[in-house]
Interface confidence: medium
């Protein structure tokens, strides 16, 4: 239904902004725990990994839930 | 300590309904996203539904799509699962999850048994 | 809706042996563009809520023994318990995050000897 339709889109918008939140919270985490890694002359590969997985989460978002593609979420969503 | 209590459960007829809820603590209940998986007893798990922490996001198995609605009061750190027209094959037990990272569900409540039989 | 194929459905090992626990999915669960595989592992034992053991196909949880590790991507992935513990009795299930519904694998169940 049109209902459900506007309910899934919502909770997929809603998702995304968590999501980026999320990405920003432990990218910063991760740069801040690079930096006292370094200055021991620690090296880690951890931040890339994480850097990967949130920079196309938004790209890949739309795949997580069957929509019809009238309500595909367009640019509007990739905020 | 995080914990997720679910209630609700019990024996319903064929056609009826039944509410389930699952009471949190221990977490920002209004910043998280909540789910309902289901197993049935000596069976595999089944996802059955997701909710956004606004709770005007809802996602639901093909499964229980129009017969079951998710919910949720974030004043009262509660999920809810409205299970109508029940049947048989909804016989199972029910498990509130939480995740604290988009993908795994890495926190989960006891379960509360549902039955549906005449 | 992405189906999940575990295999064995069950394994009986002696502690110290080590279990492989395999998942095939009917379709790719891999982003192309960031090649992470959104599988994850989880644990159940007898009368207990699913434990997550293991998230993006190879990342374990936190306080997790390290004799629990994950491995694959696209459509095969598995689950090794490198040195098998009285306590790792137990059903273990894949799941797929990529795309709705979230299926869920049938199960392996792993009994100890």
């Known amino acids: 239904s049109e209902a459900e339709d506007a309910s899934l889109l919502s909770f997929m918008q809603g998702y995304m902004k968590h999501a980026t939140k999320t990405a920003k919270d432990a990218l910063s985490s991760v740069q801040e725990s690079q930096v006292a890694q370094q200055a021991r002359g620690w090296v880690t590969d951890g931040f890339s990994s994480l850097k990967d997985y949130w920079s196309t989460v938004k790209d890949k978002f739309s795949e997580f839930w069957d929509l019809d593609p009238e309500v595909r979420p367009t640019s509007a969503v990739a905020a | 300590e995080l914990q997720l209590v679910e209630s609700g459960g019990g024996l319903v007829q064929p056609g009826g309904s039944l509410r389930l809820s699952c009471a949190a603590s221990g977490f920002t209940f209004s910043n998280a996203y909540l789910y309902w998986v289901r197993q049935v007893p000596g069976k595999g798990l089944e996802w059955v539904s997701g909710?956004?922490?606004?709770?005007?996001?809802?996602a639901y198995a093909t499964s229980v799509k129009g017969r079951f609605t998710i919910s949720r009061d974030n004043a009262k750190n509660t999920l809810y699962l409205q299970m109508n027209t029940l049947e048989s094959d909804d016989t199972a037990v029910y498990y509130c999850?939480?995740?604290?990272?988009?993908?795994?569900?890495?926190?989960w409540g006891q379960g509360t048994q549902v039955t549906v039989s005449s | 809706e992405i189906v999940l194929t575990q295999s064995p459905s069950s394994v009986t090992a002696s502690v110290g042996e080590k279990v492989t626990i395999n998942c095939k999915s009917s379709q790719s669960v891999e982003s192309g563009s960031d090649q992470k595989s959104y599988l994850n592992w989880y644990q159940q034992r007898p009368g207990q809520s699913p434990r997550l053991l293991i998230y993006y196909a190879s990342t374990q949880e936190s306080g997790i023994p390290d004799r629990f590790s994950g491995s694959g991507s696209t459509t095969d992935f598995t689950l090794t318990i490198s040195s098998v513990q009285p306590e790792d009795a137990a059903v273990y299930y894949c799941q797929q995050a990529y795309s709705a519904p979230f299926t869920f694998g049938q199960g392996t169940k792993v009994e100890l000897k």
């Open positions: 909710i956004n922490p606004a709770g005007d996001g809802r």
């Open positions: 999850a939480t995740a604290s990272r988009v993908v795994a569900y890495d926190s």
